[in-house]
Interface confidence: low
Amino acid sequence: MALPTARPLLGSCGTPALGSLLFLLFSLGWVQPSRTLAGETGQEAAPLDGVLANPPNISSLSPRQLLGFPCAEVSGLSTERVRELAVALAQKNVKLSTEQLRCLAHRLSEPPEDLDALPLDLLLFLNPDAFSGPQACTRFFSRITKANVDLLPRGAPERQRLLPAALACWGVRGSLLSEADVRALGGLACDLPGRFVAESAEVLLPRLVSCPGPLDQDQQEAARAALQGGGPPYGPPSTWSVSTMDALRGLLPVLGQPIIRSIPQGIVAAWRQRSSRDPSWRQPERTILRPRFRREVEKTACPSGKKAREIDESLIFYKKWELEACVDAALLATQMDRVNAIPFTYEQLDVLKHKLDELYPQGYPESVIQHLGYLFLKMSPEDIRKWNVTSLETLKALLEVNKGHEMSPQVATLIDRFVKGRGQLDKDTLDTLTAFYPGYLCSLSPEELSSVPPSSIWAVRPQDLDTCDPRQLDVLYPKARLAFQNMNGSEYFVKIQSFLGGAPTEDLKALSQQNVSMDLATFMKLRTDAVLPLTVAEVQKLLGPHVEGLKAEERHRPVRDWILRQRQDDLDTLGLGLQGGIPNGYLVLDLSMQEALSGTPCLLGPGPVLTVLALLLASTLA
């Protein structure tokens, strides 16, 4: 098939913004001699024009010709030709840039069969969902472990989708990992969130030691807690030796002062003395034992012609000290919205953050905060406590950055500052927060919940209430009752069901008259004090066909306490074999008032039940 030789400067690869970035990269020498494994080191890339357009055989091209292909050239090729190109690149060990890999992956529309024939790093850019079967995913992720995951920054969508897919593929449930699991994950183990570090410290900490990028806040806190806890493999900091410090090299930056203080001083001194003679150790040692941001060159002037006139893509080629010297903090503050679109490294972002910190020591203004984007992930809770965030748009913009992740300490602090700044939890704020964090409602105290308007209750889903405790449901239930009051019986029950943990006895009695067939799981979440006064007949009507489930729960609250309150004769009418009711001929006295006055702690229910033998005959009572 003849392919067109003429091609646009940039093809359909990526967004317009990416297109212009690529154009900039080309003009700044993107097509560089890359080091290749086939010995092409230091060779110039051959002229590119039309080189892929019509060769008799792509595999006949030399590594030098293949080295610098632009995205636009690939966008003109058929899928089959793209596959041929990918295989040729792999065979000739051509080292590709991230953009080239992304571009190839974009054009390989269907999941390739011959994974082993493709460039290893190309797999990072393929969608793992395309390899969903157990054999397919195992083959895919076995190859991925050998790829250089760090070609992708941590925030890159391609990287973010790999870890959950890999965990699912290897059958990891929960947060407990084996050594084999960690090995199978390869470089992706460096992305495991803090809960894995907390539960699998013994196997995971030695792996995190060699992760190239910095750990995120969540991982750092978990690693710090695990190291401070003194469990395996390193033991308590007070027992560490110089060899332990060596083994921990990559985790040294996360050690807090409490840990450093508990390491024997002689060990720290010996280790510092030795590491100062070994250049490869100077970086981590400096990181943990001196202030966090250190200028490499204290008062370096900006080189001629390098002063930044605006925040643009050219800055990604600046060294850290050049950014520090050549970017004006005020300029950065006014053009913060541009930072997010530029692929800065973590180290470069640290420099930019430091510049803002110097410009605004009392905390950033909202105009800057709103445009922080991914720089927000670099902020500490201490930084955020200095902010005054009043705009819901600012809150949304920053929550968007953290979307899909668990609530981090930074986000928790941000929300706290926002709500305190507003003085109340209005509907718009609540809607925004529950949209990003479904469990948010249950994270509020009863006092805070009391300011939630009933109209907001309509947006609450059952799973949003999973972590609510009885005191919170006590506040939410009346609001839900008010919100759903105009619905008919069955619809009302569906909506109110998840709030019933806060329902009083009279409402449960009313529900028992409506054939609602409450399931046992809901019944078990009801307030014990609300269940106790219900009669056997009322419970039978309330549960309907589910009443048989009481037998399985007879030893658990509230069923256990309710059984103790019922006459055995009445329980027997259910035909379930429930035992523990009050025998016939006994009188029940409720001494809950007396107990309250005596101040005795009550462990089994709201008021102990005292049964005494009746002195009067049953017939006399009748």
Partner: nanobody, 115 residues
Framework: VQLVESGGGLVQPGGSLRLSCAAS????????VAWYRQAPGKEREFVAS???????SYADSVKGRFTVSKDKAKDTVYLQMNSLKPEDTAMYSC???????????WGQGTLVTVS
Amino acid sequence: VQLVESGGGLVQPGGSLRLSCAASGSMFSINAVAWYRQAPGKEREFVASINTDGTTSYADSVKGRFTVSKDKAKDTVYLQMNSLKPEDTAMYSCIYCRYDGEFAYWGQGTLVTVS
């Protein structure tokens, strides 16, 4: 979240102390709050914990002598320590587990010396 423990100090055997663990910078509800202690040269050990619903658990060595409680309105958890013994000497720290179980926050600790 910042945790600040207080209430530690020097006390004679048989005496009492009440430790507090206050959380600042957070309005988030908590699943569990636990007290741990670490004596010089020993490993950190669990002392007591309290869940959102108020249920408590204790290490065997402190059962009947220590009581854990909380004041939700003040975001503070207390450890009432009675009949103190010399072996209770340690640095006492509290840990807050966030409601979604995702993060644990440790305090810096408060020193209790029974002598």
